[in-house]
């Protein structure tokens, strides 16, 4: 007796974070025995879509010509072979940016900071929002969420970094969002360049400090601990 069919691989091109109006292609790759591919979207009646495989039958393409709010969400795909349906793929979270106006990102006291000192990145939105995200360019896991505790709406979120090391240097952007959909984000803020000067220390602060970073800026996101003072926001990893 053969075991369950292996799960397919699901991904999006050019990526899973798409600006409103832009096109995106969702790919599902199974096996050469696949006869049909099915794409399901969380909280929608299934199947969300269905496609015949492309030669040599080991994958299928689901095209979204123009990204809108309706397409944002969590997807899984399956394929059908002569022996039945596969296990579901790991989920793909398709996020749309451009749902709200862009926030402003600033650094306090300054974007030029000496190594070992403290800096706070401040993300401010014009209208009250309950989720703020900080993105660092070229980070493998770039999303850091600050979410309000009880759905309370905030105009800003603070991302404190202390002590600062060379690892923290780089280009940041932030987004704001409403909690009713984690998949709808604002336009990105203008980029903020954080410049760390006078770095003489080992850029690997001990994990007991309030902000820890791993081997380098390409490897890990910022990982703050504890709650944000006076903001009513709570840190979450999604």
């Amino acid at each position: 007796q053969a075991g369950p069919l292996p799960k397919p691989t699901l991904w999006a091109e050019p990526g899973s974070v798409i600006s409103w109006g832009n096109s995106v292609t969702i790919w599902c790759q199974g096996t050469l025995e696949a006869r049909e591919y099915r794409l399901d979207k969380e909280e929608s009646p299934a199947p969300w879509d269905r496609q015949n495989p492309l030669e040599p039958k080991n994958k299928a393409r689901f095209s979204i010509p123009s990204m809108t709010e309706d397409y944002a969400g969590r997807y899984r795909c399956y394929y059908r072979s002569p022996v039945g349906w596969s296990q579901p793929s790991d989920p793909l979270e398709l996020v749309m940016t451009g749902a709200y106006s862009k926030p402003t990102l600033s650094a306090l006291p300054s974007p030029l900071v000496t190594s070992g000192k403290s800096v706070t990145l401040l993300c401010q939105s014009r209208s009250p929002m309950d989720t703020f995200l900080l993105i660092k360019e070229r980070a493998a896991h770039p999303l850091l969420h600050l979410r309000s505790e009880h759905g309370a709406q905030q105009h800003q979120a603070e991302f404190p970094m202390s002590p600062v090391t060379s690892v923290h240097g780089g280009t940041y952007r932030c987004f704001s969002s409403h909690g009713f959909s984690h998949y709808l984000l604002s336009h990105p803020s203008d980029p903020l360049e954080l410049i760390v000067s006078g770095s003489l220390e080992d850029p690997r602060p001990s994990p007991t400090r309030s902000v820890s970073t791993a081997a380098g800026p390409e490897d890990q996101p910022l990982m703050p601990t504890g709650s944000v003072p006076h903001s009513g926001l709570r840190r979450h990893w999604e």
Epitope: D40, P45, A46, W48, D49
Partner: nanobody, 121 residues
Framework: EVQVVESGGGLVQAGGSLRLSCAAS????????MGWYRQAHGKQRELVAA???????KYADSVKGRFTISRDNAKNTVYLQMNSLNVEDTAVYYC???????????????WGQGTQVTVSS
């Protein structure tokens, strides 16, 4: 060959109830979203309710709390239980089957012939 067939329409007084049925072939029923649209005279066809093979259901705001969609997998049949009917519910009701992506675009893969529901005051 008609692959989706509705029944159960008729004339009912305002405040009354009706149950529509839609029978489909096993192949269509087991692999598609099943749902109901309606089209009133001179108006655009609108999605009323739908149910997926995963059990997720969707309703138009105008029928929430009054209409219930259900599917009987043993009979390859989908039902629309309509309660507290009002004059505005008067329309031809169409059963449909297809993927959800097309459902929301009012272009499912399979359509029934339609059954008339008339609600009198």
């Amino acid at each position: 060959e008609v692959q989706v067939v509705e029944s159960g329409g008729g004339l009912v007084q305002a405040g009354g109830s009706l149950r529509l049925s839609c029978a489909a072939s096993e192949t269509i029923f087991s692999s598609n979203v099943m749902g109901w649209y309606r089209q009133a005279h001179g108006k655009q066809r609108e999605l009323v309710a739908a149910t997926g093979i995963n059990g997720v259901t969707k309703y138009a705001d105008s029928v929430k709390g009054r209409f219930t969609i259900s599917r009987d997998n043993a009979k390859n049949t989908v039902y629309l239980q309509m309660n507290s009917l009002n004059v505005e519910d008067t329309a031809v009701y169409y059963c449909a089957a297809g993927v959800w992506r097309n459902f929301v675009m009012r272009s499912p893969d399979y359509w029934g012939q339609g059954t008339q529901v008339t609600v009198s005051s």
